[in-house]
Interface confidence: low
């Protein structure tokens, strides 16, 4: 065998050679006839009335074609003929590319709360062979599922996604990414999640900074509550009792002056939004009031009382009630 | 400027010919595909075919597909429409547009009247 | 099916609120885009992808979409708006252009 071609894989739209080449030549006639077997070339001769075949090269040892603007109808087995004695024949093979004419990703909503579980769809248009998706959120890869269509050779891929959205993921980028021996480089497309969040409350001991509360002093509490949509109500109330008269509430602050034994218990911060609703309880314990010592006459004594502050919170979250948005809790 | 300037319509009669041109100015015209719309008097918009910025892919609305050509020569910024075998129905005042899926860009159209 | 259909006409008072609706198939999986056409003119991209605009169209008009209806709203129609709007997608294949058949927009 003296005839030797290379299969050529090329990109929908650009150029492609083909070459057929001889190893010993004796001057004999060689022609190149496309995939119905029509004469491309016979020597530095072209027939078919197709101007995209252009010659590159002609020699006793090579013929070498370029064909533009290659479409996908020009893909399959292009022949070499060498008209030696007896004849001989290679063929080699025209793959096109098609990189996906166009990349949507869909979501099925614009917000969504925690805990729910959305569906994402990337589709790669009209590609060959067929695209690869990968999903991605933020830098974390995840699993889709994906339905390949074919039409006329060409492949449309749709890829789901089915993903279980938690509060960190607000403002995550969801990225559907194409991989395609077509493209080179980095070809996705992204969409950023929205998620809705039931709030997450926490209790500051503002005042007395040490922590120790005792009687006669002042206490000042503030809760901080966040979520999405940011709460639109915060209510202090005490548990299982009425709240002391001497108690003001200003906002997210519970304000109680002139601490006594009767003050103790627990009070709860409430926080809710759309979503839901959540609270956490701090247990007030009002301590006795320092003792004071008369000075001794003839001696000084120093006492140093070291005094543990227990500060015990507990957080307790619900869901939302019954006509609001359900989330599942965590 | 940014524009599209289509040429070439008139008066042909039925089993005629005619070849539409658009000349593009002030974009990179190889790097979009490129359609043609034609819309008939007092009716409404109608897609008839498309390329590639490559000129590599070419697509047909039904109704002109073996009759219309669409091709492009990127080196002089111009996009063509040869239409063979027109009928009366093919009367159309004909837009071409840059295809970015949308069409963001929109000739004034030139007239073709089809008519014995 | 690949057919687009619209409304042929719809009247809005001045100021007031108008939506312009446009059905098919292939909405369920594309978004449309809108163009606005004024007599003896081009067509202009209003709206295209989920709600975008190219610059210099005004902010009072949006783009939705849900299910196989695609719309485009109006909020505080000018006289100016008084058009026919065009609404285009394609086909599964994503190969072959469809338009809707236009609605006729008079601003009373």
């Known amino acids: 065998q003296n005839l030797f071609t290379k299969d050529v894989t090329v990109i929908e739209g650009e150029v492609a050679t083909i070459s057929c080449q001889v190893n010993k030549s004796d001057d004999s006639v060689i022609q190149l006839l496309n995939p119905n077997r029509q004469t491309i070339y016979f020597r530095d001769f072209r027939p078919l009335k197709d101007s995209r075949f252009q010659l590159l090269n002609f020699s006793s040892s090579e013929l070498k074609v370029s064909l533009t603007n290659v479409s996908i109808s020009d893909e399959g087995r292009y022949f070499c003929q060498l008209y030696t004695d007896p004849p001989q024949e290679s063929y080699t093979t025209i793959t096109v590319l098609v990189p996906p004419r166009n990349l949507m990703i869909d979501i099925q909503k614009d917000t969504a709360v925690e805990g729910e579980e959305i569906e994402v769809n990337c589709t790669a248009m009209a590609s060959k062979p067929a695209t690869t998706i990968r999903w991605f959120k933020g830098n974390t890869e995840l699993k889709g599922k994906s339905e390949v269509e074919e039409w006329s050779d060409m492949y449309t891929v749709t890829s789901q996604l089915m993903l279980k959205v938690h509060k960190e993921d607000d403002g995550v980028p969801v990225i559907c990414q194409v991989e395609h021996p077509a493209v080179t480089g980095n070809l996705q497309t992204q969409r950023y999640l929205e998620v809705q969040y039931k709030p997450q409350v926490h209790i500051q001991m503002t005042y007395p900074l040490q922590g120790l509360t005792r009687e006669g002093d002042a206490l000042e509490l503030t809760c901080e509550a966040i979520g999405k949509p940011q709460p639109v109500m915060v209510t202090w109330v005490r548990v299982d009792d009425e709240m002391p008269q001497h108690a003001v509430l200003s906002g997210p602050n519970l304000f109680i002056n002139n601490l006594n034994k009767t003050d103790n218990g627990t009070y709860r911060c409430e926080a809710s939004n759309i979503v839901g609703k959540a609270h956490s309880d701090y247990m007030l314990y009002v301590y006795d009031p320092p003792t004071t010592i008369p000075p001794p006459t003839t001696t000084t004594t120093t006492t140093t009382t070291t005094t543990t502050t227990i500060l015990t919170i507990i957080t307790d979250s619900r869901a939302g009630e019954e006509g609001s948005i359900r989330a599942v809790d965590h | 400027e940014v524009q599209l300037v289509e040429s070439g319509g008139g008066l042909v009669k039925p089993g005629g010919s005619l070849r539409l041109s658009c000349a593009a100015s002030g974009f990179t015209f190889s790097s979009y595909a490129m359609s043609w719309v034609r819309q008939a008097p007092g009716k409404g918009l109608e897609w008839v075919s498309a390329?590639?910025?490559?000129?590599?892919?070419?697509y047909y609305a039904d109704s002109v597909k073996g009759r219309f050509t669409i091709s492009r020569d990127n080196s002089k910024n111009t996009l063509y429409l040869q239409m063979n075998s027109l009928r009366a129905e093919d009367t159309a005042l004909y837009y071409c547009?840059?295809?970015?899926?949308?069409?963001?860009?929109w000739g004034r159209g030139t007239l073709v009247t089809v008519s014995s | 099916s690949s057919e687009l259909t619209q409304d042929p006409a719809v009247s809005v008072a001045l100021g007031q609120t108008v939506r312009i609706t446009c059905q098919g198939d292939s909405l369920r999986s594309y978004y449309a885009s809108w163009y606005q056409q004024k007599p003896g003119q081009a067509p202009v991209l209003v709206i295209y992808g989920k709600n975008n605009r190219l610059s210099g169209i005004p902010d009072r008009f949006s783009g939705s979409s849900s299910g196989n209806t695609a719309s485009l709203t109006i909020t505080g129609a000018q006289a100016e708006d008084e058009a026919d709007y065009y609404c285009?997608?394609?086909?599964?294949?994503?190969?072959?252009?469809?338009f809707g058949g236009g609605t006729k927009l008079t601003v009373l």
């Open positions: 390329i590639s910025g490559s000129g590599g892919s070419t």
């Open positions: 547009a840059r295809d970015n899926w949308y069409f963001d860009l």
């Open positions: 285009n997608s394609r086909d599964s294949s994503g190969n072959h252009v469809v």
